[in-house]
Structures are given as structure tokens and as C-alpha cells.
């Protein structure tokens, strides 16, 4: 606890101290205060350097003195024989004896007092910046007039921050300006104008002077502009050494004058002004700005429009321009927007046709689609190209947008029919000779396969199931490859209206009308043992004359079984009508007069025993195309006979393409249209 | 030429267990259904079993109904019969058959149109 | 179970004879019956199918006739080698049912 005064005696005193003792006092008295220590009684053992015995002074780290030997004052007035001044409050005694004494030494007696100090005169470095003044226990610092003392309570300064200008012009000038300016000061200048305007600082080299650097180079007096986390400066030296117009890109500016305690100089003078923000002219590849100007600021609208062939892609919505808004910071609103390359995206796939991946899908790229040959071509031209338009579609040259339409080739066998012996009287056949031909398995029939949704039969075959189970794609019925095989399920049964439905079609002597159409829930994929076969033409050169030769198939009774369990086929030639009526009926149901014969009706067969027969029921009788060698056209449909390996009628197919193209059309779907 | 040989037949005392085998040749295998009829000595011919082409349909006579399993490899032409519990009744000469089966969902069958020479069983005591 | 009925259980005929054998289901079987012929020791041999078509290579003096319950199967013209047992098989439905065989002895 620090005391004002006090006393310290050596050990014993006033008696004889003993040997070989060290004993230290610690003097502290309050802060703000020196010590004065004194001594009125000396008397140790004297030595050089005072060696043996000593009583020690020690402030801090200094030694301010170290006493021995006998000691009287000089002053008859005063008792004092020694005494020390030191202006820190704090002080250390240390008294030590050795272990011999020749005399009997009575040591010493001491007394300090607080003091005041002058901390204004009595330090090397001066506590104030402007006045100091000194009172008892400590001081205090003042400013002259127009200064204020800062925080520190030291230093001394001029009140010139807090400025805030806010008008789109101004001039600011350092204070006192041109006089010179106030030391050891700190000016912040604030210029805040609106957002979308920049500030723009003018000076004249002239009106500037500031103390110059150092030899190190570094400002002892300094202006700085600070705009956001841009920097100019710092400045000093005669004349303003940076530049004369300062365009800070910022509506906000801050303007920081430091000075020291040296060296005042008239200082600075400037004005400023608001400049709208400008933006920058940028270049936007593949695009035209509407308008377009030399400099564009704050609140310029500019329109920017893609080249065809080029979009701007927002998300998922593609847009041919947009608008920009030079904004209050300098930038570009909708900036991240860029006219890119339209893209057409991946090729939509089509049915029975591919398109390879394009090495590109953007504007200018080019694809080709193709049909799966040979079973399907291209049904509405345009040769399969397209290339990406503008418009980000796809389009081909004749097309337009419109996909090409894959379909089925008809009428082409991948391998023709070869007669290898000699279905009655027919030959063994595969199923790749007759693709078309489809297998009904109750009754037990046959049918003709004319496109991916539709086949063609006789009205008897399905006018008590219409509901038939079909099948494509196998030479054999055995159930074991059948289940291997495509398997068509019905839609809908189109019986011909002028087909005659009876209670008993046991009994049947009409057969007149005898075709129907069954529409396909699916559609049928084709390939080497599916596809279809043609239709007639409706030309005269689709009419069959005697002789002309046709191929039946099918899985029908033969001369060695019921039910054929391979597919046998026979080529035979169309005959005259009457040979049909003469044949005698093998098992009539009713009297020979009362079976019908019409035109709807071809006659063919009769030679070599080759006849189509039961089981055979509703399969084609291919012709070869007039126009076309290559292909087949099913110019009939087996129906019934007389008498199987004699001749057999065959529904005449030509009869009936109006009705077959009208049923069709009105049952299609859309994905047909 | 078309073949089926039956193997696999011998004496068992009753309740014993048997395996027929029929190794078919000289035919798509599992393009046909098979059957296993038995004669037993100096009587008539009777229908066992029967599977389908591709085994997932079997039929049994009364007679052997769940002692009786009528099995096929196509990979191996072969027909199998497992005879369990087996009884002096079931003392016959045991012939495979092939079966055609024509059509698709609504089928045809043509039974029984090659024949095996048989293979004996003998149930005794 | 369908029963199928076959009579006469035996015959003597001569050689040249016709024959005739009936087989009688208990219920309508449609035409689903095949006959055979089984000469001893042998296995049996299918000769008609579909209660009337001739098995393949099958001499044409077998004929098949009849539907849904009655069915006849005829030799026109009886020769040697057609001694044997006769039997018919219904295959209408599971299980199959044979007929009980008919005996074809030499008169």
C-alpha cells in the first residue's frame, strides 16, 4: 500500500548492527508522486566501494547510490547527512553487513517523504503536445484556441471531420487553407452523393502543398482518397503529384488529411462533381445493341438482340433478346445473359428408324435420319436431313419440322419361294418367303399381314371368334415355337357388311364378300419373318387373267395330315370361274346349284393336284406386282372350295381396296395419321 | 431315324423308389410334349403322365397322383419319372411316348405317335 | 374321368374280312381319339389320329369315323400282319383314358 512518508532504520539501530545481515526495504508512495529519501544518522563499517558494508539506493534498474562509512550534516540547521531525489514513486533500501566487524557500527536511520513532480520540465520526452501544466500528484494538457484535446488527453488537434457533402458539386479545402494548416491533425472529408453517380475529384497542381515525404519515401503529412476498396494516395510534397482528375467509380468518398507536429504548410484546395456512372461498352458476341451510342451511364436501357441462329437461355426459356440497365454501380444488369449458339437439343427418335447421335445439336448441325432397311423406308421423303434452324427446330428442306415417317416395305420376301417337291400337293416353305403370312390357331386359319396395325383375313375365319389369337414370324406351329414367336392381340374385328351372317355357317353356300380386317392393339415390329404384303392397285393393271400365276401359303390339311405343322405353300395359276362351278362338291351341305359364285370371287388351281384346302382359310394369294417385279400384292384370299386339290376360290382382294383403305383410316390412330 | 429309349427299370420292394429315364434322338426335343404309359402283364395300356414342351405343364392318372414326378432336360433329350412308395400295382412295363403339340394359346394335341420299347419295373417283396 | 368303353373286347376274323371296332366315351370327347394297334412284345403304334386322319405311312385299309361319343375304327380288308390288340385313347381331357383293347385273333 503506497505511503506518503516513512522511516527505515538498520537492524538494531541505534545499537550496533549485527554481522552478516541483508535486509532490503521496497518504497512506494502514490502515483504521480517522487520521492525524496534522506538520511540523518550514518555510521558503517567504511571500506572501497563500500564493499563490506553498505547501504544501497536502487530506482528501477539505476543504482542511485550506495553509502558507508561515518557521515555528519553540513548544515548546523538541518539533521540531514545525505539525501536523494528521484521522480518515480517506487524505491528499494538494501542494507548488508559482512561477517566481521573490527568496531562496534550503529548503522543508519532514513526518512522519505512524497514529493511532487513536474512532469512538464522534468522528463526528456514533453507529455503535452501544445501546453502542459503541472499540479501536485500529476499534470494535465490544454490546447490553444480552436484546438481540441484528443482521447489521449495529450495531443492536440483541429475539429475539422464530420463533413458530409451530399451535393452533386463542391469544393473542400484543408483547414485554414491557404493559411497553413493545423498540425498533429487528423481531417475525414465524407462526399455522399446518390447511387448511380460517381465522384470525380479536380485539383490544380498549385493548390497543393503538403509537407513532403521522407527520405524513406513515406508522407509525414498525407490527403488519401478512399472510394469503397479503392485507394489514391497517399499525397503530399509542393505541387499535387498524382492525378488531376480522379474518377473514382464509386458514389461514395471518403478524403483523410493526417498531420504531424512538424512542418505546416498551406495545404490543399479541390473541387469535385457527380458524373453518372458509366458502363462499360462490352462486347457481346453474337448480338446488336439498339441503341447504339459511343458512352452509355447510369439509366441507358440498351435492347440486345441475338444473330438468328442464337438465343439467350434463362433457365429452361430461350428468348431472342433482352434488356440491359447501366446501373448504379457501373454495371450491367442481365450481365451473366449471353447469345449462345440455339440448340436444338437431341433429335427426337422415330419408330422403325434411327438417327446417329450428332457429333453437335447446336445451329448450323446437321443429322440424318434413316429407316431400319430394308424392312422400312422413308414414306414422306425429304431424304432424311435435317439441319438445326434458327428457330431451334430441327427442320429438313422439304419437311420442315415434320419427323420422317418410317413404314413398312411391303411385298418383299428376304428369300424367295422355291418350289423343292411336289397346302395339297404343295411344297415345304419358310416363313421368310411368305413374311406376311399370319397364323390364326382358332379355327385354325390364316391371314395376311397388309401393315403394322392391320391384318386381312376371311370373314369366316373370324366371324365366330372376334377375338383371334395370331401369330407371326414362324415357319412351325408347334407350341413350342409359336411361344417364341410374335404373338398379335386384336383390337377390333371389321367384318365386310356384305358379309352374310348365318345361325348355322356349317350350312354356308355364300360365300360372297368373304374379308375381313383385324386391327391390331400394337404395332407389329417387322424384320426378316415379318412384313407385310402389298395391296392392289385399283389400275386395270391389278386385273388377273387366266393363267396368271399366284403363291398361296399356309398350315392347312395336306395330303398327310389335318394340320400342316410346318408352312406349305404352292404356286398356282388363276382359271376361269366355270372350272370352280364344275367341280363336284366333296361333302355339300347343301344342293351344288345353291352355292354362289360372283366377280368378288377368283377361281385358281386345278393343276398338279396343288390346292389350298381347310386350315388354309384366309391367307393370300400373292401375285407378283406388274409394276414392280420385286414385290407381292395379295391379290386374293383363300376362302372356300369345292373340293381341296382341285380349284379353290379366293376372295378377289381388288374388290375391296376402297373399303379396306376407308376402315382403315377411320380406325387409325393418331400416331398413323 | 426318330428314337426313345427307356432305361431305368428293376426290381424294388414296395415302398421303394425308382427313375425312369427316356433318351430321345433323331427329333427336336423340346419342340414336343412327352407321355409315359404302362402295360402291366397281360393287361391293357395305361396313360401315367404327361408334360409339356418346356415343363411348366404336367398331368397324373389318378392312380400315381402324388407319388408319381414326371420331369424333362432339353438340354439332355430327356424324359424322367421319379416313382416313390411304390406297390405291387404299379408292377408294368413302362413306355414313353411322344406328343405333338400344335398351335398357340388355343393348341392341338397329337398324341402318342412314337413309342419307346419300354423298360420293366418289378415291385416285390 | 372320361370312360372309354371298347367292344367287342376280342374277335376272330379271317383274312380279307372288314372289321369293324367300337370305342364308346362317356362323355362327348369332340373328335380328340387316336387308335393303336399293339402286336405282343411290341410297343404300341398309333394309326389314327383326330378320330379320323391316317397316321403317316399307314396302310389305307385303316379308317377312322365317328364324333363326340361313338367312334369306329374299320380294317376293310383284314390281312396278316393286322392280328394284334387294338386300342383307343381318348385325349380330350386329363387324364387320358385308353379303351380296354380289342383282340384281333385268327379265325
Known amino acids: 500500500e503506497p505511503t506518503m512518508y516513512g522511516e527505515i532504520l538498520s537492524p538494531n539501530y541505534p545499537q550496533a548492527y549485527p554481522s552478516e545481515v541483508e535486509k532490503s526495504w521496497d518504497i512506494e508512495v502514490p502515483e504521480g508522486y517522487g520521492i525524496h529519501l534522506y538520511f540523518t544518522h550514518l555510521d558503517i563499517e567504511l571500506s572501497e566501494n563500500c564493499a563490506y558494508d553498505s547501504v544501497q539506493i536502487i530506482s528501477g534498474d539505476t543504482e542511485e547510490g550506495r553509502l558507508c562509512g561515518q557521515r555528519s550534516s553540513n548544515n548546523p540547521h538541518s539533521p540531514i547527512v545525505e539525501e536523494f531525489q528521484v521522480p518515480y514513486n517506487k524505491l528499494q533500501v538494501i542494507f548488508k553487513s559482512d561477517f566481521s566487524n573490527e568496531e562496534r557500527f550503529t548503522g543508519f536511520a532514513a526518512y522519505y517523504v512524497a514529493t511532487d513532480i513536474n512532469e512538464c520540465t522534468d522528463f526528456v520526452d514533453v507529455p503535452c503536445s501544445h501546453f502542459c501544466n503541472n499540479f501536485i500528484g500529476g499534470y494535465f494538457c490544454s490546447c490553444p484556441p480552436e484546438y481540441f484535446l484528443h482521447d489521449d488527453m495529450k495531443n492536440c488537434g483541429v475539429n475539422c471531420s464530420g463533413d458530409v457533402f451530399t451535393a452533386l458539386i463542391g469544393e473542400i479545402a484543408s483547414p485554414n487553407y491557404p493559411k497553413p494548416y493545423p498540425e498533429n491533425s487528423r481531417c475525414e472529408y465524407q462526399i455522399r452523393l446518390e447511387k448511380g453517380f460517381q465522384v470525380v475529384v479536380t485539383l490544380r497542381r498549385e493548390d497543393f502543398d503538403v509537407e513532403a515525404a521522407d527520405s524513406a519515401g513515406n508522407c509525414l503529412d498525407s490527403l488519401v482518397f478512399v472510394a469503397g476498396d479503392r485507394q489514391f494516395g497517399p499525397y503530399c510534397g509542393h505541387g499535387f503529384p498524382g492525378p488531376l482528375n480522379i474518377e473514382t467509380k464509386s458514389n461514395a468518398l471518403d478524403i483523410i488529411f493526417q498531420t504531424d507536429l512538424t512542418g505546416q504548410k498551406k495545404g490543399w484546395k479541390l473541387r469535385y462533381h457527380g458524373d453518372p456512372m458509366p458502363c462499360p461498352k462490352e462486347d457481346t458476341p453474337n448480338s446488336v445493341w439498339e441503341p447504339a451510342k459511343a458512352k452509355y451511364v447510369f439509366r441507358d436501357v440498351v435492347q440486345i438482340t441475338c444473330l438468328d441462329g442464337f438465343e439467350v437461355v434463362e433457365g429452361r426459356v430461350g428468348a431472342t433478346s433482352f434488356y440491359s440497365t447501366c446501373q448504379s454501380n457501373g454495371k450491367w444488369s442481365n450481365s451473366k445473359l449471353k447469345c449462345q449458339p440455339v440448340d436444338c437439343g437431341i433429335p427426337e427418335s422415330i419408330e422403325n428408324g434411327k438417327v446417329e447421335d450428332p457429333e453437335s445439336t447446336l445451329f448450323g448441325s446437321v443429322i440424318r435420319y434413316t429407316c431400319e432397311e430394308p424392312y422400312y423406308y422413308m414414306e414422306n421423303g425429304g431424304g432424311g436431313e435435317y439441319h438445326c434452324a434458327g428457330n431451334g427446330s430441327w427442320v429438313n428442306e422439304v419437311l420442315g419440322p415434320e419427323l420422317p415417317k418410317c413404314v413398312p416395305v411391303c411385298g418383299v420376301p428376304r428369300e424367295p419361294f422355291e418350289e423343292k417337291q411336289r397346302i395339297i400337293g404343295g411344297s415345304d416353305a419358310d416363313i421368310k418367303n411368305f413374311p406376311w403370312q399370319v397364323f390364326f390357331d382358332n379355327p385354325w386359319a390364316g391371314g395376311a399381314l397388309i401393315n403394322e396395325y392391320w391384318v386381312l383375313t376371311a370373314a369366316h375365319v373370324v366371324e365366330g371368334n372376334r377375338e383371334p389369337t395370331m401369330y407371326v414370324g414362324s415357319t412351325s406351329v408347334q407350341t413350342s415355337r409359336l411361344a417364341k414367336s410374335k404373338m398379335l392381340t386384336p383390337e377390333h374385328v371389321f367384318i365386310h357388311p356384305g358379309w352374310k351372317l348365318l345361325e348355322v355357317p356349317e350350312g354356308r353356300t355364300n360365300f360372297d364378300n368373304d374379308i375381313a380386317l383385324v386391327r391390331l392393339k400394337d404395332p407389329v415390329k417387322m424384320g426378316p419373318t415379318v412384313s407385310p404384303i402389298c395391296l392392289p392397285g385399283t389400275s386395270s393393271d391389278y386385273n388377273l387373267m387366266d393363267g396368271d400365276l399366284g403363291l398361296i401359303s399356309g398350315w392347312g390339311r395336306t395330303e398327310k395330315r389335318d394340320r400342316a405343322v410346318r408352312l406349305k405353300a404352292a404356286r398356282l395359276p388363276v382359271a376361269p370361274l366355270r372350272k370352280c362351278k364344275e367341280v363336284k362338291v366333296e361333302k355339300p351341305t347343301a344342293d351344288a346349284e345353291a352355292y354362289v359364285f360372283t366377280p368378288n370371287m377368283i377361281c385358281a388351281g386345278g393343276e398338279k393336284g396343288m390346292d389350298s384346302c381347310k386350315g388354309d382359310s384366309g391367307g393370300a394369294f400373292a401375285v407378283q406386282d406388274p409394276n414392280d417385279k420385286t414385290k407381292f400384292y395379295a391379290a386374293g384370299l383363300v376362302s372356300w372350295g369345292p373340293q381341296c386339290g382341285t380349284y379353290g376360290l379366293y376372295t378377289r382382294v381388288k374388290n375391296y381396296v376402297d373399303w379396306i383403305m376407308k376402315t382403315m383410316q377411320e380406325n387409325s390412330t393418331p400416331r398413323e395419321d | 431315324q426318330v428314337q426313345l429309349v427307356e432305361s431305368g427299370g428293376g426290381v424294388v420292394r414296395p415302398g421303394g423308389s425308382l427313375r425312369l429315364s427316356c433318351a430321345a434322338s433323331?427329333?427336336?426335343?423340346?419342340?414336343?410334349?412327352m407321355s409315359w404309359v404302362r402295360q402291366a402283364p397281360g393287361k391293357g395300356l395305361e396313360w401315367v403322365s404327361g408334360?409339356?414342351?418346356?415343363?411348366?405343364?404336367?398331368g397324373y392318372a389318378d392312380s400315381v397322383k402324388g407319388r408319381f414326378t414326371i420331369s424333362r432336360d432339353n438340354a439332355k433329350n430327356s424324359l424322367y419319372l421319379q416313382m416313390n412308395s411304390l406297390r405291387a400295382e404299379d408292377t408294368a412295363l413302362y413306355y414313353c411316348?411322344?406328343?405333338?403339340?400344335?398351335?398357340?394359346?388355343?393348341?392341338?394335341?397329337?398324341?402318342?405317335?412314337?413309342w419307346g420299347k419300354g423298360t420293366t419295373v418289378t415291385v416285390s417283396s | 374321368d372320361i370312360q372309354m368303353t371298347q367292344s367287342p373286347s376280342s374277335l376272330s376274323a379271317s383274312v380279307g374280312d372288314r372289321v369293324t371296332i367300337t370305342c364308346r366315351a362317356s362323355q362327348g370327347i369332340r373328335n380328340d381319339l387316336g387308335w393303336y394297334q399293339q402286336k405282343p412284345g411290341k410297343a404300341p403304334k398309333r394309326l389314327i389320329y383326330t378320330a379320323s386322319n391316317l397316321q403317316s405311312g399307314v396302310p389305307s385299309r385303316f379308317s377312322g369315323s365317328g364324333s363326340g361319343t361313338e367312334f369306329t375304327l374299320t380294317i376293310s380288308s383284314l390281312q396278316p400282319e393286322d392280328f394284334a390288340t387294338y386300342y383307343c385313347l381318348q385325349y380330350r381331357s386329363h387324364p387320358l383314358t385308353f379303351g380296354g383293347g380289342t383282340k384281333v385273333e385268327i379265325k
Open positions: 411316348a411322344r406328343d405333338e403339340q400344335l398351335g398357340g394359346k388355343y393348341y392341338y394335341y397329337y398324341y402318342m405317335d412314337v
Open positions: 408334360i409339356n414342351w418346356e415343363g411348366g405343364s404336367t
Open positions: 433323331g427329333f427336336t426335343f423340346d419342340d414336343y410334349g
